[in-house]
Every structure is written in structure tokens, then in C-alpha cells.
Amino acid sequence: TPWSLARPQGSCSLEGVEIKGGSFRLLQEGQALEYVCPSGFYPYPVQTRTCRSTGSWSTLKTQDQKTVRKAECRAIHCPRPHDFENGEYWPRSPYYNVSDEISFHCYDGYTLRGSANRTCQVNGRWSGQTAICDNGAGYCSNPGIPIGTRKVGSQYRLEDSVTYHCSRGLTLRGSQRRTCQEGGSWSGTEPSCQDSFMYDTPQEVAEAFLSSLTETIEGVDAEDGHGPGEQQKRKIVLDPSGSMNIYLVLDGSDSIGASNFTGAKKCLVNLIEKVASYGVKPRYGLVTYATYPKIWVKVSEADSSNADWVTKQLNEINYEDHKLKSGTNTKKALQAVYSMMSWPDDVPPEGWNRTRHVIILMTDGLHNMGGDPITVIDEIRDLLYIGKDRKNPREDYLDVYVFGVGPLVNQVNINALASKKDNEQHVFKVKDMENLEDVFYQMIDESQSLSLCGMVWEHRKGTDYHKQPWQAKISVIRPSKGHESCMGAVVSEYFVLTAAHCFTVDDKEHSIKVSVGGEKRDLEIEVVLFHPNYNINGKKEAGIPEFYDYDVALIKLKNKLKYGQTIRPICLPCTEGTTRALRLPPTTTCQQQKEELLPAQDIKALFVSEEEKKLTRKEVYIKNGDKKGSCERDAQYAPGYDKVKDISEVVTPRFLCTGGVSPYADPNTCRGDSGGPLIVHKRSRFIQVGVISWGVVDVCKNQKRQKQVPAHARDFHINLFQVLPWLKEKLQDEDLGFL
């Protein structure tokens, strides 16, 4: 074990607590320990032990209360199906090892729903969905028997109920009792039986949480006035008169620890970002708690719907704030939420019944004071008139999500607090804070948001292309002339935006190689579309050897790109996507976007360059204020431009200028960076404002970027606001919603 056998801070010796085949770590300053086993193994007979007041560790007891002398890591098995109605499964076995498969078949007259084949996963859970053989005769469809559970009840008429049970030692998550409701839906949520060693994987949590959350926040056209059992997916219309309150409740007790607290804050920042990306502006309440709760943001505050401001408040919260009173009083924390929901003098304000409430609770588990928090959830349901009227139960108006983090989580407690809704999951148990952070990164990246422009996966495990998923590498092979390298940006599923000068009129489509997402394979090109006003030789007679005005081109791909974590579009100016990315009102005009992105001042921006096979972001300032003139004048130092009398002959209104030493020394672009995007990074989103075109000084001779460069080393980029009519015309079928 990694621990010395010295006595911990608590009062229990570590003598003999080792686990065969694994290690242990101390929790709660030595008052508890957790056994850790390699992947595919679990600690037997228990996962955690507590230090008793007698100075000894809690006994190693099996589920049937037999005492074991020494803990050991045992191979994880998946439970076997206790029952399978109206069909057969194969192979039959008392237990199943990781990667074992079973398949399900239905008797004649029955149809299979769910997964016909399921695989035992490394976390002890079966892949896929519960397999159900149903003949479609019942008023409700057969709710199924999730593997590991036992079901009592086989009648599915309106108002019939079924109940579920778990074997001894396993905890039931979800609904123990489900009732067949009007419209053919089952009340509650599908149950499952959890062993203490089972955790939800980040991917599972991200998918389940998001699919439930998007049901709550997506503004989807739906008829209002849902019947009690209306089985349609829970679609909620956020009509202008309705609204949404999201309450973030964060455990700051001793057992959480400072780094976990910071991690949880990161998760919530990502969540706020995610919700904002849907164009929804909920009001936020923000509570941290230990022995007492502390309200940081009230939903009634004017700025509570300003995602940036709420994020700022969240980032400023300090773990130390609860230092002196470090119990875990979840009940008090939920009472703080209740107080935010309730109205003065018990007089409901206009529209109270159109406000949807979402509580997101992150805790490491055990409330150890204040009493049972479930009573407060009941009070909240009462206040919001939920579940009282059979005709209009209003269940859609409250969602309680509980994230249990770490080994001490009491699954029964967190399950009791969480909402239970058909086909949704509101309770999650993750291994540690790192896993929870993964959840929220994955969540930001889920498939529904893949088409959102300018989103990146800023995660410690992310590759270069996770962080710059729009970046495209372009090379043009010219027989006997070597090859030209450029960059570009994915702007839609069929188009990459780059510089026109990367190509000549003689370049054939097959000689142009484009790769995205860091993939080795090249994409097939259909055509390269040049801006009609681009003509590099346009001013040769005037003694200007190369003229880069309108230096933009679009590469049309033969096949549609498949967006994923490493391939996704950058935002273009004057599109609906950018309006949403900047969280501007839907009525925002192109001019207003321009003022937001390119105000008349020095504008912080970035470009992406490849150095030693790695993509790196380079921070620069667009000189768009008082330094603009001097920046543009430095173009005269460019080779071939020394004879130019009026610099506006070469620096047309189409260009943005970066580089130089003021306000900061900007890094410069290299030849291979041409065609790449000049980007403004705002509100965690990336918007392309320019295309890298040409530079005054070649700072990258001999493949090395020079450290010392002259003050007149400037770079010029085509301003996309100046070529919008062309972009709009060529990208008209790409669903970008040009303003």
C-alpha cells in the first residue's frame, strides 16, 4: 500500500488493513478508508471502512453478515437475469465475467424492445437497454425486468402497479413501484440494483443527465397542458411568459476537500456554459453548504440570469468559507433553496406556475446532521403544487438531480432525493471528482451540440484537435515544384475556409490535400471557390508584384464531414450561431455583432500555428483603434512594397492588422499558417474574424520561429466582415443562418 503503517490522524492503526491485490487510501483525515482495486476488480467484502471510537476499524462483513479476516480484490461480475418474461436468454450462467455477452429472444407473438445483445462491462453493468418481450396487448407496454432486479406484477392495465426488489446487499436505484398511467406511460423511472462498488462512467452520466436536462431546457414546439401520463418525450415550451430557475447546490463540508470543491466548481461553470449554449437564459441560485448553507446568488437578483456574472460569482467562492463549521447539513441547504422559491407574504406572483425549477445537488454523500432532507423536497413539491392534481400533476416543473461523488455516497439517500421520471435518470454516482469533471466536459460536447460552432473540449485529456477542432491542414502538391502548406478552418459540414493565394489556377483538385481532426487520411475535394475579386497580379502594372486583396477561398468537400470532438466548425460573423455563441438577443444585427467582435480598439485575438508537429495558440492584438494607422503603414517594409507611394494601395479596407510590440509583443504568423483563422475568443466560444493572408517579415526562416523580430513585423488578415456577401452566397445551403 502507498501508506506508511504509522498511526493516522484518527485513532485507528493501519496494521493489517491491507487488501490483497489492491491498495487503500485514507478519507476524512483518517476516520475512514477506501479500498482501491485495479480496473475489472472490486473490493471484497466492503469498499469502505470506518474508524470506530474504540480505536478499531469496522469489521469486514459480507452481505450475509459473515466476518472475513482479510479484504481482497475480486473480479467484477455482472448480475444474472433473475427472470426474463415471454422469452429466453442465452447462455445461462450463475454469473458473468467482464466482456461476457448474453442474447435475448422472444417467444412467438412477442416483440423484442431494448437490446437483443448485451455485454458485461468493466463497471459490473450490462451494456445497452433492458430487453423486453412484449405482445403490445397491455394498456401500458411491459416495463421490463432490468437485469438483477425482481419484478412483482404482470398486469399492465391502467392503474395497475408493478414493484421491484433487489437481492440482499444491493441497493435499488430508481423507482421501487411503478404505476401504469393514462396515455400508456409508467410512473417513476426504471429501477436498477447497485452494488457499492458500482459507479456510473462519465460517458453514461453525461448522456443520461444531458438527455434529461435537454428535455427540460430545449425550447421544442409542443402542446402545453400535458396530461398526467402523457408519454411524449418531456418537451417543454419556454414561452416568453414562462421561465426557469436553476439552483446549484454544492457540498463544501470537510469530507469534500479543497481540490474536489474546486473540481465541482469547474463542473458547474461548464454546466452554466452548456445551458447558455441552448440560448436559454435561466435565473440561477447558488448555494454552498456544510453545517450551514451560504447563498451566493439569489434567483431574485437582477444579474442572476447573466451567465457570465453567475460564473464569476461561482469562481470567487472559496472552500475555506465553510472551514469552521464543516458538518454536512443537506436539509438546511435545501431549505435555503426553498426560501428562494417561496414568495413574500405567501402571495404567489403572476406567472409563478409557469416557472420550472431545476435543483442540481453535488455531494460526497452522507448528511450527518439536520435531519432527513427528503422532507424539504416534499415541502418544495407542495409549494409548487406538484403531484396534487391528478389531471395536472405538474411534474415537469421540478427536476432534482443528485450527483454523488466518491465511495462514501449513501445510495439510498441520494436516490430518495432525486426526481424519478420515465426514461430519465436524475441520480448519479461517480467514482471521484476527476470523473465528474469528465462528465461535464463530455456533456458540453454531446452530439446535439456538435453542430454548435466555436465549441472546444478544453480538457486535460484533450488533444490538439480537441482544443482546435476547426483547424484544417492543407497542402498542394505541385509536380517538380515541391508543395505548398496552408491552414484553413472548418466552417460547415462541406466547407473549409482558407486563403486564395494557397492555390494557383493550375492546381487540380486531386493535388490538393485537406485533413481535419488530426486524421491521417485526406479529404476528397469537389472544388475550390475563389473570391471573384481576388487577383494576385491585379496591380503588377502599378509596380505591386503581389496584391492580396480579397485573399479568401472556400474548399468544397465531396463528402459531408462527420462532426465529433475533434472536428467541428468555427463560428462565422453575422450568423445565428454566432449570435447564440455570444449570448446576444436573437434580434441582434450584423452591425451589432461587428461592434461586439471588432470594436475600435486593440482587440485580443489568436491564431493557431503548428510548431514541431503540435498546434499552439498564439495570442495577438488586432490594431483596430489608434494603432491601426501605424500598423498598416508598416506594410511598406514588406518585400516588393518599398516603392508603394500610398500604402492603401496594398492595405485595402479588407485587411485587419496584427503584430508589432504594442500593446504587447505579438507573435507573428509563418508561411504555413496562411489561410488559417484569426479568431476572437469570447464567452468560451471561438469566432473567426479573419483569414491569415500575408506578413511583412518572414520570421520563420529555417523552419524556426525567430525570437527577436523587428517592431515593424506585422501580419495582415482578410476581415470576414468585408467579404460577407460572398460567404453568404457560397454557403447559402449550409444552414448557418446568415443575418
Partner: antibody, heavy 120, light 113 residues
């Protein structure tokens, strides 16, 4: 085969009560909900409610709440529907109907009907 | 309550011809997860109790001739008799069981032309 035999026609005064019986045979009485539907002369059909003969649990249409009582006697496989505080617009043929084992919503078997006339 | 509206109120069709009765509900009867429509059709001949013809909007009850068929989804449903027979003269009712109270259409009287 499944049979539902209802009691005979009744004539009642306004304000009185009527109790219609429905005797089931040819199947296990407690396994199937019994539903009551009425039809005023020359009018359409109107669902009144059901009883689960197994548990005795009932579900009534809001319209009849407080006036209707559905009961059963499992020993003689008979379901009853009592309607109180009768009004002239309660004049109708009252049917008992049985659904399927799996789904009580589809009325596959019907009694012959009982005409209840409410008249002063 | 869900209101069921049938059209036409009455219909005269020649023997051997197709008869079509429509039924419209005031809200959707479709369960989108199971793709089932909670609607049934009944036939009632004079002096008799109703008879179940179709359930789940399109599933024919056993023993019902195959000239009877049901179609539609959501809020609009149709009962079709492909070739009218003399014994099909009756009143036809649609019924929703999506929400309580279960409600019937006002009925469509089918006669021979």
C-alpha cells in the same frame, strides 16, 4: 363462453336510486375489470367508470362522482352499479362491459343492457 | 376532457362500395415512445350493445371481417369498410382511452343507398 347478464328494466322517480346488477359467467370474474357505460335514448355512449373485482377498487368519471357506487360480490360473480339522486336525464340504457385480461380499455364483451327510466 | 368528433353524422353508401368514417380528437392519442394510438372503433346495431371492431387504431378484433380497417395517427383517424354489406348497417363510434374520462364520438349512422 363469456356471458354478462344484466338485471331487468327499472322505472324510478326523480331523487330515488337504482341498482343494476351484472352477472358474469364463462371466465374468472376477479381477473377482469368490469366497466359501466350508459346510452341515453337516441344518444351516444358515455363511460361511467370501472371496478376491479379482485380488489374492489373503483374509478369513476368525474361527472358521476358522488352519485355512483360500483360494488361486486365475488361469491356470485356479480358486479353492481348504483346511481343515486336520479334525474330525468339519467334515463338511459346502462351496460356492463368487460375488457381483456391485459387491457381493460377495449370492451370486448357487453351485457344486454338495462333500461332505467326516470319519470315523475 | 378529450372531445371526439365524428364526420359525417350519417352516411349512405351503395352495397359493395367503400364507406369511410372519420374521427378527430381534440388532442393527440399517440404515445410517441410506443407508437401506439389509444383509439378504438365500435359498431352498434339497433337494439344491441356495441361490438368492438378495431383497437390500437388499426388492430382488427378477432372475428371481425377484413373489409373493416382502421387507420390514422395522432388526432385524425378513419374507419373504412372496403365493400359495404347489408349487415354493416349500424351506428359506428370511435372511442379514446388516452386520458380519463374515456370518451366516445357522437356516432355516425351508416345506411345503404
Amino acid at each position: 363462453q363469456v356471458q354478462l347478464v344484466q338485471s331487468g328494466a327499472e322505472v324510478k322517480k326523480p331523487g330515488a336510486s337504482v341498482k343494476v346488477s351484472c352477472k358474469a359467467s364463462g371466465y374468472s370474474f376477479t381477473d377482469y375489470y368490469m366497466t359501466w357505460v350508459r346510452q341515453a335514448p337516441g344518444q351516444g355512449l358515455e363511460w361511467m367508470g370501472w371496478i376491479n373485482p379482485n380488489s374492489g377498487g373503483t374509478k369513476y368519471a368525474q361527472k358521476f362522482q358522488g352519485r355512483v357506487t360500483m360494488t361486486r360480490d365475488t361469491s356470485i360473480s356479480t358486479a353492481y352499479m348504483e346511481l343515486s339522486r336520479l334525474r330525468s336525464d339519467d334515463t338511459a340504457v346502462y351496460y356492463c362491459a368487460r375488457g381483456y385480461y391485459a387491457n381493460s380499455a377495449w370492451f370486448a364483451y357487453w351485457g344486454q343492457g338495462t333500461l332505467v327510466t326516470v319519470s315523475s | 376532457d378529450i372531445v371526439m368528433t365524428q364526420s359525417p353524422d350519417s352516411l349512405a353508401v351503395s352495397l359493395g362500395e367503400r364507406a369511410t368514417i372519420n374521427c378527430k380528437s381534440s388532442q393527440s392519442l399517440l404515445n410517441s415512445r410506443t407508437s401506439k394510438n389509444y383509439l378504438a372503433w365500435y359498431q352498434q346495431k339497433p337494439g344491441q350493445p356495441p361490438k368492438l371492431l378495431i383497437y390500437w387504431a388499426s388492430t382488427r378484433e378477432s372475428g371481425v371481417p377484413d373489409r373493416f380497417s382502421g387507420s390514422g395517427s395522432g388526432t385524425d383517424f378513419t374507419l373504412t369498410i372496403s365493400s359495404l354489406q347489408a349487415e354493416d348497417v349500424a351506428v359506428y363510434y370511435c372511442k379514446q382511452v388516452y386520458n380519463l374520462p374515456w370518451t366516445f364520438g357522437q356516432g355516425t349512422k351508416l345506411e345503404i343507398k
